[in-house]
Amino acid sequence: EPPTACREKQYLINSQCCSLCQPGQKLVSDCTEFTETECLPCGESEFLDTWNRETHCHQHKYCDPNLGLRVQQKGTSETDTICTCEEGWHCTSEACESCVLHRSCSPGFGVKQIATGVSDTICEPCPVGFFSNVSSAFEKCHPWTSCETKDLVVQQAGTNKTDVVCGPQDRLR
């Protein structure tokens, strides 16, 4: 009686269960009454990452430098190439098909999380007691200067964009 279902890593064709090709190999010929499945290794710059019956291997992803991309991990016959972005840039999507410049945090905002090759800069507003007076992709909010520890007094209050201005204590009693 011909099978209606096959074991794991097999497929049903012409009423026979044939072995799938292992990762890194493509299907040439289905198994027959006389032969096992015929598989061939993927060529240079090709891959297949699953047990399969594909007759063509997939092309490795190309990390296009014109799009700001570079190779993070070279592909093998069983894995695709992984692209990442050049320094100062990050991927626009999970697939990392193109890159954009990391955003900078405006004055009044500091870097909460520095950008990586796959994620943009995360900014946060500087809370009371902190400031940022530059547009930067790296600078965090800095704490206001503590005038007291310098034996000085606040002459001008700080904001989220400016530090406090300290001055000498009024000596008149």
Partner: antibody, heavy 113, light 112 residues
Framework: QVQLVESGGGLVKPGGSLRLSCAVS????????VYWIRQAPGKGLEWMGM???????DYSTSVKGRFTISKDNAKTSVYLQMSSLRAEDTAVYYC???????WGQGTLVTVSS | ELQLTQSPLSLPVTLGQPASISCRSS???????????LHWYLQRPGQSPRLLIY???NRFSGVPDRFSGSGSGTDFTLKISRVEAEDVGVYYC?????????FGGGTKLEIK
Amino acid sequence: QVQLVESGGGLVKPGGSLRLSCAVSGFSLSRYSVYWIRQAPGKGLEWMGMMWGGGSTDYSTSVKGRFTISKDNAKTSVYLQMSSLRAEDTAVYYCVRTDGDYWGQGTLVTVSS
Amino acid sequence: ELQLTQSPLSLPVTLGQPASISCRSSQSLASSQGNTYLHWYLQRPGQSPRLLIYKVSNRFSGVPDRFSGSGSGTDFTLKISRVEAEDVGVYYCSQSTHVPWTFGGGTKLEIK
């Protein structure tokens, strides 16, 4: 439908060469394997070798080094190049597809002086 | 090279009676993937061989159910439950597990 047709047989002197062709139709040689079998007059069947779909070849010990199997995917033909022929190579040569029961009609090779 | 030994060489049978042919291999015919590529052919007089049984026990399409195959490892058998006139010819076992593929020497079935 699937067909295999052999040609190229004939009379050849010992030490001579001959090329048999197996023209196929109804299937692709890049997806199916084909093998050659021979049968000497009044004798049994002998497997000569095969051409796999992927292009690799295998041979029997009796003909390895003397016979070469090749194929032309575009011309849809498989060839058996026979050299240094001997009297014991006299036989009907069949090409066969490696699934189902698809045989050519056979072509007779006679090696005699 | 793997040898297939068939017995008997000649098999005279009365019409309607059963017949049995043995095929012994010089090494196991189980493949690395668990398949056993042992097959049976019938060559009728003046014709090319015709596939009867593939992979030990699978009847090829159009083959009458009076033909059956069995066995494993190195010992295999072809049985005909009731011989008919059209069954006359030479029966060959064949293996395609190991390269080079090989055939048995043949068993000639004739009617008594």
